[in-house]
């Protein structure tokens, strides 16, 4: 399995290197998932012809999956740091029932998985301690997200495969945008 | 790491235009955020503007919005800067750099591959 951000050799190496601020941490962990995130795809991808399909075929999907838009404050035009921060945290909060779902969804990269998982939990808890406005953030029903897993379990073979491929792209997306944003806070 | 060429770059009036390009052989540039940065005899290299992996996803240093737009057309493995209303202090040479996670961001540490830089000279 792949060693979480801060405990590489490298790391164990250079033992007086300055402790990392909490922009680089963050920065530092969202690379760490998306370096996860690069693994997975390329097993989906091994497994099954998904990634050959247009972006515009793959669309047509009924999975709400977080997306930025440009009210949510994280591009250029209208950047807002506080409304953006909102966005990334309650975002990571909606993907977790999907990243629930890839658990059982690999063969050889398993613990990949499970590490994409909780390392996203990680940049949670990271990300709230920086954000002023908590009270802003909603999270998802636990109901609504065990039926949605429930149901997203019972589809057949061939959605199951679209769906972790689309999961695994839009959760790339995501991250990509949010630290762009992140980066310029 | 990507190889990454620059090109386009020239003498031009002020208020004229040019269009750089940069461009790999690099069969997943795709993936790649993609910035452009620029230094002046004398002064330190700053960021111009930068592109995501997502192409609507684009960034602009205060000095050229408006004035400058990235783009990128994968099918050609090739960003472009277009630069129009040069003015004498747009003068530098400007590099390309691209990020493999797909991120960028205006800090020369973001990038992992650097181009040998185009000469851009606006003078009358």
């Known amino acids: 399995a792949p060693v979480p951000p801060g405990e590489d050799s490298k790391d164990v190496a250079a033992p007086h290197r300055q402790p990392l601020t909490s922009s680089e941490r963050i920065d530092k962990q969202i690379r760490y998932i998306l370096d996860g995130i690069s693994a997975l795809r390329k097993e989906t991808c091994n497994k099954s012809n998904m990634c050959e399909s247009s972006k515009e075929a793959l669309a047509e999907n009924n999975l709400n999956l977080p997306k930025m838009a440009e009210k949510d404050g994280c591009f250029q035009s209208g950047f807002n740091e506080e409304t953006c921060l909102v966005k990334i945290i309650t975002g990571l909060l909606e993907f977790e029932v999907y990243l629930e779902y890839l658990q059982n969804r690999f063969e050889s990269s398993e613990e990949q998985a499970r590490a994409v998982q909780m390392s996203t939990k990680v940049l949670i808890q990271f990300l709230q301690k920086k954000a002023k406005n908590l009270d802003a953030i909603t999270t998802p029903d636990p109901t609504t997200n065990a039926s949605l897993l429930t149901k997203l379990q019972a589809q057949n073979q061939w959605l199951q495969d679209m769906t972790t491929h689309l999961i695994l792209r839009s959760f790339k997306e995501f991250l990509q945008s949010s630290l762009r944003a992140l980066r310029q806070m | 790491e990507v190889q990454l060429v620059e090109s386009g770059g020239g003498l031009v009036q002020p208020g004229g235009s040019l269009k750089l390009s940069c461009t790999t052989s690099?069969?997943?540039?795709?993936?790649?955020?993609v910035g452009w940065f620029r230094q002046a005899p004398g002064k330190e290299r700053e960021f111009v503007a930068d592109i995501g992996e997502q192409a609507d996803n684009t960034w602009y240093a205060e000095s050229v919005l408006g004035r400058f737009t990235i783009s990128r057309d994968d099918a050609k493995n090739t960003v472009y800067l277009e630069m129009d209303g040069l003015k004498p202090e747009d003068t530098a040479v400007y590099y390309c750099a691209a990020d493999k996670y797909g991120v960028g961001g205006n800090a020369q540490g973001y990038y992992d591959s650097w181009g040998q830089g185009t000469q851009v000279t606006v003078s009358s």
């Open positions: 690099g069969r997943r540039f795709s993936e790649y955020a």
